[in-house]
Interface confidence: low
């Protein structure tokens, strides 16, 4: 599984090289699942993608997401996941030219086809949580995270640090 240890490896690499800028530091292909081991899957329908949160049978192939890691150009005032006060951010792309976007107006997580440079809505601050889990905080709306609401992904506001470990905003990254 690609959890805290994997992220920390890249965090150390960031610290060593002090890379900044708009190019990704590294890219990683992983399957994304919820804290409760439901898979996040993507299906092409009428030239746009649907996002599903569902139980997969053991023999069903998990969808992979390309995570591109960036170091924030602006120092973070908060300690925790940053490197020397800088934040680690990711974009998530399940297929060529499509990226997860935060639609803060609709409180939804959407897939949009777009060209680089990507808009801020496609960037998420990566938080290392417990039990090899990560969470994704909207760059455009601090305190709002990608989460699972019923059977779909949504944007969920986390109003206190104690709620950072609520299961519905925790995700697992896995190489398998």
């Amino acid at each position: 599984a690609f959890g805290i240890s994997g992220v920390q490896k890249y965090t150390r690499a960031l610290h060593d090289s002090s890379i900044t800028g708009i190019s990704p530091i590294t890219e990683y292909l992983a399957s994304l699942s919820t804290y409760n081991d439901q898979s996040i899957t993507f299906a092409l329908e009428d030239e746009s993608y649907e996002i599903y949160v569902e139980d997969l049978k053991k023999d069903e192939k998990k969808d992979k997401v390309l995570l591109s890691y960036y170091e924030s150009q602006h120092p973070s005032n908060e300690s925790g996941d940053g490197v020397d006060g800088k934040m680690l951010m990711v974009t998530l792309s399940p297929t060529k030219d499509f990226w997860l976007h935060a639609n803060n107006k609709e409180h939804s997580v959407e897939l949009h086809k777009c060209e680089k440079p990507l808009p801020d809505q496609a960037f998420f601050v990566l938080h290392n949580m417990h039990s090899n889990c990560v969470s994704f905080e909207c760059k455009t709306d601090p305190g709002v995270f990608i989460g699972v609401k019923d059977n779909h992904l949504a944007l969920i506001k986390v109003d206190s640090s104690e709620n950072l470990c609520t299961e519905n905003i925790l995700f697992k990254l896995s190489e398998t």
Epitope: D46, S48, E50, I51, N103, S108, D150, N151, H152
Partner: antibody
């Protein structure tokens, strides 16, 4: 085969309440949004609200908030819609329906409909 | 909330005619869906995501459009196609157009 079978026609007096049931089969009831849509005689379709049986999460149209309650019984795969303080203009066919499983932008379409329940409100 | 306006509200046509129904949204939607309703029956999904035919729907039905303007076309009207057609769109929940009644001329 996906099926939504609704309860029979009802006649109610103004001020009364009605509770319409919708029994689902052919799919995992817990995993799909159930919609309630009504249609007054000779009129178009009007969305009332929806409920996700897996968690009981519900959303209601502003027009019906405070007057409608949607519930589910996952043990029997049945959805219920109760409308209170009935008026004559609530006379309509009430449909339960099931959304397509997808969610994401533009994923709100209804894929299956119940046969409808006629509710007549008359003194 | 998004409002959907269908036109025409009714159309008289003959078997074999080409019929076009339009649906206009007050703001851009990513796709449109269409339902068919026959008298005394429940609606039935006809087209989803703008142009995809629902299971069992004949190929004479087609859908197109983007942004705020969408179209349902019946290329050659058949006797069983006389019905009312509703467009449906929206993000968080379905919104319906006012309906278009296709009648026999």
């Amino acid at each position: 085969e996906v099926q939504l079978v609704q309860s029979g026609a009802e006649v109610k007096k103004p001020g009364a309440s009605v509770k319409v049931s919708c029994k689902a089969s052919g799919f995992n009831f817990k995993n799909y949004w159930i919609q309630w849509v009504r249609q007054a005689p000779g009129q178009g379709l009007e969305w009332m609200g929806e409920i996700f049986p897996g968690t009981g999460t519900s959303y209601y149209s502003e027009k019906f908030k405070g007057r409608v309650t949607m519930t589910t019984d996952t043990s029997t795969s049945t959805a219920y819609m109760e409308l209170r303080s009935l008026r004559s203009d609530d006379t309509a066919v009430y449909y339960c329906a099931r959304k397509h499983r997808g969610y994401g932008y533009g994923g709100a379409w209804i894929a299956y409909w119940g046969q409808g329940t006629l509710v007549t409100v008359s003194s | 909330d998004i409002q959907l306006t269908q036109s025409p509200s009714s159309v008289s046509a003959s078997v074999g005619d080409r019929v076009t129904i339009t649906c206009s949204a007050t703001s851009s939607v990513s796709s449109m869906h269409w339902h068919q309703q026959k008298p005394g029956k429940a609606p039935k999904l006809l087209i989803y995501r703008t142009s995809n035919l629902a299971s069992g729907v004949p190929s004479r039905f087609s859908g197109s459009g983007s942004g705020t303007d969408y179209t349902l076309t019946i290329s050659s009207l058949q006797p069983e196609d006389f019905a009312t057609y509703y467009c449906s769109g929206g993000y968080s929940h379905p919104t319906f157009g006012g309906g278009t009644k296709v009648e026999i001329k």
